[in-house]
Interface confidence: low
């Protein structure tokens, strides 16, 4: 099981389009967050493609990786696993039409509040939110 602080809210698919499409704005922040500690080129390619799918002015939240080493690895694994499940949902919906529950595929829990930048966000960083 993923640690409590590692549980992320990842809304995979949009429910307002037919067929449902990848909810790029919800997924992108997580890939941007794991980008530094993942393979540079592969993650960049995924981000690039997700960027193309995103509507121009859709809002995007900033997410961070946890500072703890174990939690960080779990976090990255969770994101990749969820993204894989997202893609499966997309393929299924394309093949068989939308299924109940697939439109809002997510892992319950709260998003991680730490800043995107900095491995130890409690040390010298401070933040201010733009709404």
């Amino acid at each position: 099981m993923v640690p409590e602080s590692n549980r992320t809210l990842l809304l995979c698919l949009t429910s307002d389009s037919q067929p449902p499409r990848l909810n790029s704005s919800a997924i992108l922040p997580y890939f941007r967050a794991i980008r530094p500690l993942s393979d540079k080129n592969i993650i960049d390619k995924i981000i690039e493609q997700l960027d193309k799918l995103k509507f121009q002015h859709e809002p995007e939240t900033e997410i961070s990786v946890p500072a703890d080493t174990f939690e960080c690895k779990s976090f990255i694994l969770t994101i990749l696993q969820q993204f894989s499940a997202c893609l499966e949902s997309v393929f299924k919906s394309l093949n068989s039409g939308p299924q109940k529950g697939e439109l809002n595929s997510k892992l319950e829990g709260k998003p991680i509040p730490n800043p995107l930048l900095g491995l130890d966000s409690t040390r010298t960083g401070h933040h201010h939110h733009h709404h």
């Epitope: 500690l37 900033e62 690895k73 960083g125 401070h126 939110h129």
Partner: antibody
């Protein structure tokens, strides 16, 4: 081609203020964290400030915190550094730097020179 | 703050030979199995240029004669075979924790 062009460097008196700008082009500016790094006259490099890609998070070393403010305008592809209460030890070449994720600085501008002297 | 000590402060290497630059950190700069140590090259009158990121990854466009290794507190930049254009000052930098810090630099001269 990634380009970072700094401007605003000048000669300023101790206690004075200055605002540096960095115009970015050749990449999706809003996708990247950005930093300011300075190089002192004795050629030592010092990290000055970092801002997250959306501008929500800012970071400073203790000797800078409270005096300098990093900010960005993603619509204008521009990074800023507002410097106040300047000291002679702030004399340096200031570089605008693109961040790869949060841990790597992969492209540096040509720099803008700041001299603090009476 | 994490102190980075580079050695030697300067070195002269014959064309085609190997240059080895060391960077020692006052505490571990590894995170999640990755050394968060980076190497930059700066030629006179120019801005620094990223060569190696996260201890051993060669930045795009950087010649393969440059390589990085190390973990925790000890890191090394290797240049082999050294070429004329490699004459520059080399800096290490850690991003394991804030404040990010740099080594004092190593000036490489080609004989």
């Amino acid at each position: 081609e990634v380009q970072l062009v700094e401007s605003g460097g000048d000669l300023v008196k101790p206690g004075g203020s200055l605002k540096l700008s960095c115009a970015a082009s050749g990449f999706s500016f809003s996708n990247y964290g950005m930093s300011w790094v300075r190089q002192t006259p004795d050629k030592r490099l010092e990290w000055v400030a970092t801002i997250s890609y959306g501008g929500s998070y800012t970071y400073y070393p203790d000797n800078i915190k409270g005096r300098f403010t990093i900010s960005r305008d993603n619509a204008k592809n521009t990074l800023y550094l507002q410097m106040s209460s300047l000291k002679s030890e702030d004399t340096a070449m200031y570089y605008c730097v693109r961040g790869y994720g949060y841990d790597t600085m992969d492209y540096w501008g040509q720099g803008t020179s700041v001299t603090v002297s009476s | 703050d994490i102190l980075l000590t580079q050695s030697p402060a300067s070195l002269a290497v014959s064309l085609g030979q190997r240059a080895i630059i060391s960077c020692k950190a006052s505490q571990s700069v590894s995170f999640a199995g990755t050394g968060l140590m980076h190497w930059y090259q700066q030629k006179p009158g120019q801005q620094p240029k990223l060569l190696i990121y996260r201890a051993s990854n060669l930045e795009a466009g950087v010649p393969t004669r440059f390589s990085g290794s190390g973990s925790r507190t000890d890191f090394t930049l290797n240049i082999h075979p050294v070429e004329e254009e490699d004459a520059a000052t080399y800096f290490c930098q850690q991003s394991r924790e804030y404040p990010w810090t740099f080594g004092g630099g190593t000036k490489l001269e080609i004989k």
